[in-house]
């Protein structure tokens, strides 16, 4: 990674020049699928990808106003095994439904300290944050 | 989204106070799986999730030094249909291997313009960037 400075002093830049992060991110789901009670361990024939998958999942919100992005969504598998392609409901023990994880780059808003210890606006601290993206139907791992 | 200013003036803050984004992100794959020729349309019984999936995929690097994160990985499906759980190699036409997309928050480094048009360091411009996260085995959509 090349280095960028990440501090934003609160003064010294005209406020009208500031770019505002006001775009609303599109969650990778329909809001209804956030509700655990509206989904079950079955593969639908319509709807979003997470409900048509044979390893279906729901999304759970992770919100922190001092982080960018402020809203993240974590996948939660609805079935331990994969759903049969034939029926869309019965589970097939030959396949496991496993979470796919990803270390996402996020930025935290932190107070900045000046040379004399006084506050100088805020800093953006870059971190890696583990999120589960989806559930994937996999063949069970065979131990050698 | 709540609003944060996103400009980072290049002056006015002690350089030793700047946080440096030097952490290297862990890609969600082994480098070998970036090579298209080293993988094929089959579900492995070991290795990373993307090779054990019955909707296997490889990753392609997307690098932009003026973007944070600088490195993004796009999934590319290796099969049009899902691989049979039984054999791990033959395709099952009852299931489609579909890309899961996500609008990820990224930040572009842009020059900032002062009141008189002169450059004042750089600004971080927040954007949504479409990435493919994984390939998912789904039941084909039935049109009503």
């Amino acid at each position: 990674y090349s280095h960028w400075p990440s501090c934003c002093p609160s003064k010294g830049y005209p406020s009208e020049e500031l770019l505002r992060w006001s775009t609303v991110p599109v969650p990778p789901l329909k809001p209804a699928s956030l509700d655990f009670h509206s989904v079950s361990c079955r593969a639908s024939e319509d709807g979003p990808l997470n409900s048509r998958a044979i390893s279906p999942w729901r999304y759970e919100l992770d919100r922190d106003l001092n982080r960018l992005p402020q809203d993240l969504y974590h996948a939660r598998c609805l079935c331990p095994h994969c759903v049969s392609l034939q029926t869309g409901s019965h589970m097939d023990p030959r396949g496991n439904s496993e979470l796919l994880y990803h270390n996402q780059t996020v930025f935290y808003r932190r107070p900045c300290h000046g040379k004399k210890g006084n506050h100088k606006g805020y800093c953006l601290e870059r971190r890696l944050y583990r999120v589960s993206l989806a559930c994937v139907c996999v063949r069970p791992r065979v131990m050698g | 989204y709540s609003h944060w200013p996103s400009c980072c003036p290049s002056k006015g803050y002690p350089s030793e106070e700047l946080l440096r984004w030097s952490t290297v992100p862990v890609p969600p794959l082994k480098p070998a799986s970036l090579d298209f020729h080293s993988v094929s349309c089959r579900a492995s019984e070991d290795g990373p999730l993307n090779s054990r999936a019955i909707s296997p995929w490889r990753y392609e690097l997307d690098r932009d030094l003026n973007r944070l994160p600088q490195d993004l990985y796009h999934a590319r499906c290796l099969c049009p249909h899902c691989v049979s759980l039984q054999t791990g190699s033959h395709m099952d036409p009852r299931g489609n291997s579909e890309l899961l997309y996500h609008n990820q928050t990224v930040f572009y480094r842009r020059p900032c313009h002062g009141k008189k048009g002169n450059h004042k360091g750089y600004c971080l411009e927040r954007r949504l960037y479409r990435v493919s996260l994984a390939c998912v085995c789904v039941r084909p959509r039935v049109m009503g």
């Epitope: 609303v24 759970e60 992770d62 919100r63 808003r109 932190r110 107070p111 | 709540s2 609003h3």
Partner: antibody
Framework: QVTLKESGPGILQPSQTLSLTCSFS??????????LGWIRQPSGKGLEWLAH???????HYKPALKSRLTISKDISSSQVFLTIASVDTADTATYYC?????????????????WGQGTSVTVSS | QIVLTQSPAIMSASPGEKVTISCSAS?????MYWYQQKPGSSPKPWIY???NLASGVPARFSGSGSGTSYSLTISSMEAEDAATYYC???????????FGGGTKLEIK
């Protein structure tokens, strides 16, 4: 100045639905980063967070009570509502509404910075 | 879900005595918030973000801590400090606010 005031039925019977209203002034719940929550306190006991609603209508509930709780808001009348289904004697408490959304130079605080005076609810047969 | 455990549950202190109230989290957290509540009144925010005193809070109060261990300290107990103190945190996933069980501080 910021004020919040809770209102409720006072007394209700087991299995009924409790409806609470929080009327507020001095701030707008449509302001980015603003939120309002409900907290209850049985007599002589501690504080228990129940539910929260954000400026963008995103809602959160205490997991153990999620199936019984519903929070909503009416921006035009500056009110937030909480309903608790199938109440029991264990739901007897003082119910508070409180604001969250204080923005400092370093970011948002997740403390409830303004509270109502509370409304007493008794569930009794 | 993170659990907050306050200790002691009840304590008494003489005027001028140093008082420390502890709050332990079941897993690591970034910040802790504290409230003061007196009988018949609503809770008042007392300490923000671990160590920042709310407006009007006397300078004899301080907050500190990190990870799983946080504390509120009164350098010199006064009669008006007799109250119940609660610690509180926000957890982003799943989004929940959690309160400690409270510490009732009495004056001797």
């Amino acid at each position: 100045q910021v004020t919040l005031k809770e209102s409720g039925p006072g007394i209700l019977q087991p299995s009924q639905t409790l409806s609470l209203t929080c009327s507020f002034s001095g701030f707008s719940l449509s302001t980015s980063g603003m939120g309002l929550g409900w907290i209850r306190q049985p007599s002589g006991k501690g504080l228990e967070w129940l539910a929260h609603i954000w400026w963008d209508d995103v809602k959160h509930y205490k997991p153990a009570l999620k199936s019984r709780l519903t929070i909503s808001k009416d921006i035009s009348s500056s009110q937030v509502f909480l309903t608790i289904a199938s109440v029991d004697t264990a739901d007897t408490a003082t119910y508070y509404c409180a604001r969250m959304g204080q923005l400092h130079y370093y970011g948002y605080d997740y403390a409830m910075d303004y509270w109502g005076q509370g409304t007493s609810v008794t569930v009794s047969s | 879900q993170i659990v907050l455990t306050q200790s002691p549950a009840i304590m008494s202190a003489s005027p001028g005595e140093k008082v420390t109230i502890s709050c332990s989290a079941s897993s690591s957290v970034s910040y802790m918030y504290w409230y003061q509540q007196k009988p018949g009144s609503s809770p008042k925010p007392w300490i923000y973000r671990t160590s920042n005193l709310a407006s009007g809070v006397p300078a004899r109060f301080s907050g500190s801590g990190s990870g799983t261990s946080y504390s509120l300290t009164i350098s010199s107990m006064e009669a008006e400090d007799a109250a119940t103190y609660y610690c509180q945190l926000y957890h982003s996933y799943p989004p929940t606010w959690t309160f400690g069980g409270g510490t009732k501080l009495e004056i001797k």
